[in-house]
């Protein structure tokens, strides 16, 4: 018993005066608690407690479940403890079967003895397993035994408390123990579509996958720069343990124009966050916006290939698409695909392949696309390069020697003169006069240029050269004169070919 | 014998928050998990969340994450749930529960919060 | 999350007549042969009261007509003999694994 000064308060006394008492099931247990100012007993097994305010507390028949730490307090608040063992060979433990673990933490598996002079009071696997190799705990018959620093691998591991009880090993009810995993990583997230793009009064909805090792972590739809509430659903799976995923779903079953921004899916834990975000754009109508990949005007020389190509932008997806020439639609020589298999591509692109452009082939070429909403077209102005073409060349009764030669870009016609039999002809001969004329082709086709001179100018035999030449080549065209005393007696025009 | 005694009935406006008491005896307040269980009128019973005894770890219902808190007081053996954000899908019965022996074997008498404007 | 579904969702029965409440989880709710599936009895006004915990252990102070079966993923409730006062509603409740979950109950009347 304990001993104080006098003129201290002192503790209440206990009778009988030991810290342990042993007693046999079905006998009486009796305790006497003296203080002058006596307030209560109190009684406490598996954390639980029982008050009487008599000073003696007698139980006439013990049972297992008086098992227990039997305490008396008196006024100053001094209290005294006797505990007490109600030896049942049919019951040696008393159990609470809830047992939680944290990682890394200590945790209780309480199955206090009912009696304290059996032996070997440890833990063991149910049906025969052994314990994890690493696992450790340390008894205490009072209280049960404690396992040291859980670890997630004996999540859902099932065990007895166990004793020797006249050679023979007696173990108690099974345990199974839950660990609550530490978070030692930042949940994972991801979106089910980094972007959306809807009509006005279409339904957005988005999913946000968490993964993480419990249901403990923390997720939440937020709009960036807002704080409204949005209306989550959830589904959450156990993948095994510690493999915890919810997806959570946020949805507007109206979308407006301005709900359009990001949205933002956030997760945390005790050790970090982590986020992920998707984009929403809400319009009005649908729209087709078309960018040409090449310069809408054209110019492709006589022979050779061009590809128009252009790149659109449609929503909703495009419904027919056609390229146009002179009224008449390509069935072929096209194709139109999407810039990219992603479920929210709205990009598109078109090619027409036009091969050996002919000279009479030019013109406007028309892209039109249309999808539900709305319809979009663009035009290329094509224009074939030719080799000028020298059309006439003659000599007018007025005296003058005309030249008319086509192509395009718009030739430009040079005249030279060679004296006697000389094949080059080097003297420029200035032309009287130049006329563009008005094709009766289609617009884009070749260009018609006259060209005259006099001539009564030339005085000797030789030859006349009409040169006709663009960016594309050259023609030539000839007149041979031969006098006769003082006539002109002939004038034979011809052609040669100058590449 | 264990006990569970509950505050008293609440109303608030959509929006305010609500804390709601539960003051345990008959037993060692740390050493048991307190549950929180609520029941809306004339529905079923619908578990919040836990606080784990020891050291005071919490795991919520996703449905009430973000808005519901507890905690306790373990110089009085008080357990305090705090919901926030209320709406009228709040108004509801909430009530403490003490896990004993893998079951919810204790109850508190319930605490009605009315959310109305 | 585990989904616990109770048939039926009310019934009528009268006094002395033999009761059966079912409820099936969405998994199993067994590790290691505990089944974590417990009853509750609620009378209007009243705070829930535990009848049946780890499947068929009865609580103590509850009447024996009380017996809890079952495991895995389906349950029972039985009630031998009904008496006046075991008119009220009656849940099942897994706890393992979280989020803990209730079946939506089932309102036993007299008839």
């Known amino acids: 018993q304990p001993s104080v000064s006098p003129g201290e308060p002192s503790p209440p006394s206990i009778h009988p005066g030991k810290s342990d008492l042993i007693v046999r099931v079905g006998d009486e247990i009796r305790l006497l608690c003296t203080d002058p100012g006596f307030v209560k007993w109190t009684f406490e097994i598996l954390d639980e407690t029982n008050e009487n305010k008599q000073n003696e507390w007698i139980t006439e028949k013990a049972e297992a479940t008086n098992t227990g730490k039997y305490t008396c307090t008196n006024k100053h608040g001094l209290s005294n403890s006797i505990y007490v063992f109600v030896r049942d060979p049919a019951k040696l433990f008393l159990v609470d079967r809830s047992l939680y673990g944290k990682e890394d933490n200590d945790t209780l598996v309480r199955c206090p003895l009912t009696d304290p002079e059996v032996t070997n009071y440890s833990l063991k696997g149910c049906q025969g397993k052994p314990l994890p190799k690493d696992l450790r705990f340390i008894p205490d018959p009072k209280a049960g035994i404690m396992i040291k620093s859980v670890k997630r691998a004996y999540h859902r591991l099932c065990l007895h408390c166990s004793v020797d009880q006249e050679g023979k090993s007696v173990l108690s009810e099974k345990f199974i123990l839950k660990v609550r995993p530490a978070f030692k990583a930042v949940p994972v997230v991801s979106v089910s579509k980094a972007s959306y793009l809807l009509r006005e009064g279409e339904e957005f909805t988005v999913t946000c996958t968490i993964k993480d090792v419990s249901s403990s972590v923390y997720s939440t739809w937020k709009r960036e720069n807002s704080q409204t509430k949005l209306q989550e659903k959830y589904n959450s799976w156990h993948h095994g343990d510690f493999n915890y995923e919810r997806q959570a779903t946020l949805t507007i079953s109206s979308a407006r124009v301005n709900d359009s921004g990001v949205f933002m899916c956030y997760a945390n834990n005790t050790f970090g966050s982590a986020n992920v975000t998707t984009t929403l754009e809400v319009v009005d109508k649908g729209f087709i916006n078309i960018f040409p990949m090449i310069n809408t005007t054209v110019f492709v020389n006589d022979g050779e290939n061009v590809d128009l190509i252009v790149e659109y932008e449609a929503f909703p997806k495009p419904e027919h698409q056609q390229w146009i020439y002179m009224n008449r639609t390509f069935t072929d020589k096209w194709e139109d695909y999407p810039k990219s298999e992603n479920e929210s591509n709205i990009r598109y692109v078109s090619e027409l392949h036009l091969t050996r452009l002919k000279g009479t082939e030019g013109g406007t070429y028309t892209f039109l696309v249309s999808n539900s909403d709305v319809n979009a077209a663009i035009a290329f102005n094509v224009y074939v390069n030719t080799k000028p073409e020298i059309l006439t060349y003659d000599r007018l009764v007025n005296g003058m020697l005309q030249c008319v030669a086509a192509g395009f870009p718009e030739p430009t016609i040079d005249w030279y003169f060679c004296p006697g039999t000389e094949q080059r002809c080097s003297a420029s001969v200035l032309p009287v006069d130049v006329q563009t004329l008005n094709s009766s082709g289609p617009p884009f086709g070749k260009l018609v240029v006259q060209s005259s001179i006099d001539s009564s100018a030339f005085k000797h035999n030789g030859t006349v050269e009409c040169k006709a030449y663009n960016d594309v080549g050259k023609t030539s065209a000839y007149f041979n004169f031969a006098f006769k005393g003082n006539n002109k007696e002939q004038i034979h025009p011809h052609t040669l070919f100058t590449p | 014998q264990v006990q569970l005694v509950q505050s008293g009935a609440e109303v608030k406006k959509p929006g305010a928050s609500v804390k709601v008491s539960c003051k345990a005896s008959g037993y060692t307040f740390t050493s048991y998990n307190m549950h929180w269980v609520r029941q809306a009128p004339g529905q079923g019973l619908e578990w919040m969340g836990v606080?784990?005894?020891?050291?005071?770890?919490?795991s919520y219902n996703q449905k009430f994450k973000g808005r519901v808190t507890m905690t306790t007081d373990t110089s009085t053996s008080t357990a305090y749930m705090e919901l926030r954000s209320l709406t009228s899908d709040d108004t509801a019965v909430y009530y403490c529960?003490?896990?004993?022996?893998?079951?919810?074997?204790?109850w508190g008498q319930g605490t009605l919060v009315t959310v109305s404007a | 999350e585990i989904v616990l579904t109770q048939s039926p969702s009310s019934l009528s029965a009268s006094v002395g007549d033999r009761v059966t409440i079912t409820c099936r989880a969405s998994?199993?709710?067994?590790?290691?042969?505990?089944?974590?599936m417990h009853w509750y009895q609620q009378k209007p006004g009243k705070a829930p009261k535990l009848l049946i915990y780890l499947a068929s252990n009865l609580e103590s102070g509850v009447p024996s007509r009380f017996s809890g079966s079952g495991s895995g993923t389906d349950f029972t409730l039985t009630i031998s003999s009904l008496q006046p006062e075991d008119f009220a509603t009656y849940y099942c409740?897994?706890?393992?694994?979280?989020?803990?979950?209730f079946g939506q109950g089932t309102k036993l009347e007299i008839k």
């Open positions: 998994e199993s709710v067994d590790i290691y042969g505990y089944s974590f």
């Open positions: 409740q897994q706890n393992k694994e979280e989020p803990y979950t």
């Open positions: 529960a003490r896990e004993r022996d893998t079951r919810f074997g204790n």
């Open positions: 606080i784990y005894s020891g050291n005071g770890d919490t």
